[in-house]
Interface confidence: medium
Amino acid sequence: IGLLYPFPRDCSQAMLNGDTTSGLYTIYINGDKTQALEVYCDMTSDGGGWIVFLRRKNGREDFYRNWKAYAAGFGDRREEFWLGLDNLSKITAQGQYELRVDLQDHGESAYAVYDRFSVGDAKSRYKLKVEGYSGTAGDSMNYHNGRSFSTYDKDTDSAITNCALSYKGAFWYKNCHRVNLMGRYGDNNHSQGVNWFHWKGHEYSIQFAEMKLRPSNFRNLEGRRKRA
């Protein structure tokens, strides 16, 4: 029997092909076999089918990097990594995607889901769209909606100071942040660490964080597959 999606464009299509174990998979942007991309798929959280694009877990990877690094991506997909803004832009251009953020710290956990998530192209400086919050972590991403991405060498925030430089990270900073998941791991100094303001505030660096995306209509697709 042939695969439902011979060239899956995201982890949801890989899952609909029958792959239900979290791990590394190859997806194909726009289903084009020449645009292969290795990603980590979370096949368990809330039904699975998520492309993980950020993970913080131990501080071994340096996230205080320049524009080029954030555009391209860096790190080990099984460990700490950033998938890359170019990849995120291409993936979210394929259709309507939702964002999930999973946070864990000393046995506590919280999550945030946003129904509508996209990252613009390089020309827009990877402008963030994030809308339709639900979850337990608090709506901290709302503050960053509509912002362009900023790194220490490309300052697109609305502050006089360079937010990325001030807080030793990179993000869709405004002036400056409610979310700083690419901040300094383990740094509990004000606003410097891995922060999600409405969960743990700015003076606490969260131990584990993942950002992930999947199609907004995944539930419908999953239902169709089960019926089939």
Epitope: Y143, S158, A159, I160, K174, N175, C176, R178, S191, H202
Partner: antibody
Amino acid sequence: QVQLVESGGGLVQPGRSLRLSCAASGFTFDDYAMHWVRQAPGKGLEWVSGISGSGGSTYYADSVKGRFTISRDNAKNSLYLQMNSLRAEDTALYYCAKGQKGEGDTFDIWGQGTMVTVSS
Amino acid sequence: DIQMTQSPASLPTPVGDRVTITCRASQYIQGFLNWYQQKPGKAPKLLIYDASNLETGVPSRFSGSGSGTDFTLTISSLQPEDFATYYCQQSYSTPQTFGQGTKVDIK
């Protein structure tokens, strides 16, 4: 144009109730957080209460918590403040204010205010 | 709650002069600071948001600066229509709190 018009103020005795309304026009009402801010005669500004665009989250100053209730009717483009157990110190001009796009804790549009006087 | 302290409370100034109003937060608030202008009998008007961003339609003689705990509102050349009371407000955390106001009047 964007406009906020408050109503419902007046003279009320201590311990009684009053309901303020704010009619909004000129913007997509449910996209924005809304707030009530008050100003006692000759004094500064004091934030009273806020509500998210959907109405799912509400916030209050300690001075009014348990006595005041903020609500909204997005179908009617209206914001409300139900004020119970009123005290003399609640006497103020009450402004309805629109939150800026995004988090909504910056007040970019204000109404003209409605006066609430609590006195016996 | 975060306390916001403005200085001076009153600032008599001639037309054409440069005006500087300062605002200090009792704790670190990044750049979550806004400035409002209020004229007698009128509602407040947003001038500056996020410490340094000029609200649409506000004249360029107004500017804001600062980060962390210390902030400044500057009017480069005071005009007759600028005589008013100015308030800072932190939007970092609930409850959002205002400074006590600075009255700029004619000298």
